[in-house]
């Protein structure tokens, strides 16, 4: 290299990461194998679970505002789960990103998109529940499935917008031991006149903004919404509905537990720019907490099922339908079985939040599956007496 050739500028913390060399330690090898196995399993589970949740909630349940929130959460988790196999491959080839810079940017962006989308959607769920209790008349008039989808669309747009810097500043960096990192390179675009200042300010801005926007603000909204609901229901002398509260509480708790450590280490990493002593702690901890954040997408579907008995019932029914469709005669399939069901109007008033965990009667058998395959998955099943009763209440 000529004396005047300026090397690719890297922030000190990133350059030091590029200098870290792999160990051939046997115990570390076992940990690597276990990590590959664990992430591989999580990839498979995440894809299957979220796929099933999307099918069950989107196709086997009556569309309500609540099912809309869950649908979008599951979609976000499915995206994250779809990126997990590539992270597993990264681990399997010895912690080296062999899939190119563009895919490095895309893969990382999915992780951050899921982070923002999850935070925003959980905030929306809490605000929605709060509005139902605090402004019941307004909620009665304005809470529609169409409105919920529009809100989700706005939230997705905001999540994409917040993900842009992570796409822009993601890069592949060659380590001195030959491995390739897929990591932040905040000097990638317009490094400015002083690299040290740019490194410190940009890394801090990224860490603090994601902590605030994707974690602290959503949790503050969730906490204040919960407090407002609890106060209002106490004044009314009513017990709050159990099931939906349990579902939201479980999902929020999982979100806080899975993403909390990630944000702590992300903030520590920003501090490590000025305090090199923190770097080893960050290097050791970040891979673990990043995986924990990924696993949130695998945990959520389990929580939906565990906190919602009806979800499990519908899940069993759906799986039986799939088996029946494999065994059924072609003649029995006849004309698409979706004719006896009507599609839910996009502006139809939604049921209470309990509708997600209610038990509407619905058509069974292969006709239902074929109807779904032919594109009428949003068709509304016949509403059972319990669901009708629940629909008339406001939680």
């Amino acid at each position: 290299m000529s004396a005047n050739a300026t090397l690719k500028p890297l922030c000190p913390i990133l350059e030091q990461m590029s200098r870290l060399q792999s160990h051939s330690n046997t115990s570390i090898r076992y940990i690597d194998h276990a990590a590959v196995l664990l992430h591989g399993l999580a990839s498979l589970l995440g894809l299957v679970e979220n796929g099933v949740i999307l099918f069950v909630v989107g196709c086997r349940m009556r569309q309500t505002v609540v099912t809309t929130w869950v649908l979008h959460l599951a979609l976000s988790d499915l995206l994250a789960s779809a990126s997990l196999p590539f992270f597993t491959y990264f681990l399997a080839v010895g912690h080296s990103w062999e899939l190119g810079t563009t895919f490095c940017k895309l893969h990382s962006s999915i992780f951050f998109l899921n982070m923002f989308a999850s935070g925003f959607l959980l905030s929306a769920i809490s605000l929605d529940r709060c509005l139902q209790v605090v402004r019941p008349v307004w909620a009665q008039n304005h809470r529609t499935v169409a409105a919920a989808h529009k809100v989700c669309l706005v939230l997705w747009a905001l999540a994409v917008l917040n993900t842009v810097p992570y796409f822009v500043f993601r890069d592949t960096i060659s380590r001195l031991d030959g491995r390739i990192m897929c990591y932040y390179n905040v000097l990638l675009l317009n490094p400015g006149p002083d690299r040290d200042a740019t490194c410190n300010s940009r890394q801090a801005a990224l860490a603090v903004s994601k902590f605030l926007l994707a974690f602290l603000v959503p949790l503050a909204i969730i906490a204040s919404s919960h407090a407002a609901v609890s106060l209002r229901l106490q004044h009314r002398g009513r017990r709050r509905p159990g099931r939906f509260v349990r579902l939201v509480a479980a999902v929020v708790a999982a979100f806080a537990l899975c993403w909390g450590p990630y944000h702590v280490f992300s903030l520590l990493e920003a501090r490590a720019h000025a305090n090199p002593g923190l770097r080893p702690l960050v290097w050791r901890g970040l891979p673990f907490v990043t995986s924990l954040a990924f696993f949130n997408s695998v945990a959520n579907p389990v929580l939906y099922v565990l906190t919602c008995p009806d979800m499990l019932r519908k899940l069993r029914r759906s799986l039986r339908t799939v088996l029946e469709s494999v065994l059924v005669d072609d003649s029995e399939l006849g004309g698409a079985g979706s004719s006896r069901r009507r599609r839910t109007s996009s502006t139809a008033r939604s049921a209470s939040p309990l509708a997600l965990c209610s038990r509407p009667e619905e058509p069974r058998g292969p006709a239902r599956l074929l109807g779904w395959l032919l594109g009428s998955c949003a068709a509304s099943p016949q509403t059972g007496p319990l669901n009708r009763a629940l629909s008339s209440t406001s939680s």
């Epitope: 004396a3 005047n4 300026t6 090397l7 500028p9 890297l10 922030c11 000190p12 350059e15 030091q16 200098r19 870290l20 060399q21 001195l176 400015g192 006149p193 002083d194 690299r195 040290d196 200042a197 090199p276 002593g277 770097r279 080893p280």
Partner: antibody
């Protein structure tokens, strides 16, 4: 060809001040971090100061902190070391050095001798 | 501050000999180590950076190795121009300290 030429050294009394300069050429000066390193006669090397490429960040070891100030003028391709409250133990050959990236001094000047004596 | 201890402080060797100089840090420096060669009356010259990487224009008979706190500079076959003083320096946490030097002399 990369060239670093130090100047400003000489004899100074204890408690006195001196300003060293390092003229850089043959490379894009504003793209590189720079440092000053000194070597007492017959002794080893000691890192004295470091400055970021834009001049916003500086670092010093405890032995010189508060007495020495590193600065740079990117328009003049020049690095400076302002030395105040000089002591006998500051007597050394002072080298300016270019950082390869964030560390590692890949090019050094020929050095300038600073003698602190009464 | 991190202390860098070089050994030996001096050694006598013949042309063609294999020479090994070690540098021990008082704490883990994560491969953030450089080796310099200095000849009398001259400025130091970078030989190895990041513990294992050979600097531009440095002959392949020089090599760096090590990890954690222990690092080594090896000259596989000593040449007449290699007789000099060698210094290690860490770049982990400031202040960036040097080893006291190892003088390689002709036997």
């Amino acid at each position: 060809e990369v060239q670093l030429v130090e100047s400003g050294g000489g004899l100074v009394q204890p408690g006195g001040s001196l300003r060293l300069s390092c003229a850089a050429s043959g490379f894009t000066f504003s793209s590189y971090l720079m440092s000053w390193v000194r070597q007492a006669p017959g002794k080893g090397l000691e890192w004295v100061a470091r400055i970021s490429n834009g001049g916003s960040t500086t670092d010093y070891p405890g032995t010189v902190e508060g007495r020495f100030t590193i600065s740079r003028d990117n328009s003049k391709n020049t690095l400076y070391l302002q030395m105040n409250s000089l002591r006998a133990e500051d007597t050394a050959v002072y080298y300016c050095a270019r950082h390869r990236t964030n560390w590692d001094f890949d090019y050094w000047g020929q050095g300038t001798l600073v003698t602190v004596s009464s | 501050d991190i202390q860098m201890t070089q050994s030996p402080s001096s050694l006598s060797a013949s042309v063609g000999d294999r020479v090994t100089i070690t540098c021990r840090a008082s704490e883990n420096i994560y491969w953030n180590l450089a080796w310099y060669q200095q000849k009398p009356g001259k400025a130091p010259k970078l030989v190895v950076y990041a513990a294992t990487q050979l600097a531009d224009g440095v002959p392949s008979r020089f090599s760096g190795s090590g990890s954690g706190t222990d690092y080594t500079l090896t000259i596989s076959s000593l040449q007449p121009e290699d007789f000099a003083t060698y210094y290690c320096q860490h770049f982990w946490i400031t202040p960036w300290t040097f080893g006291q030097g190892t003088k390689v002399e002709i036997k």
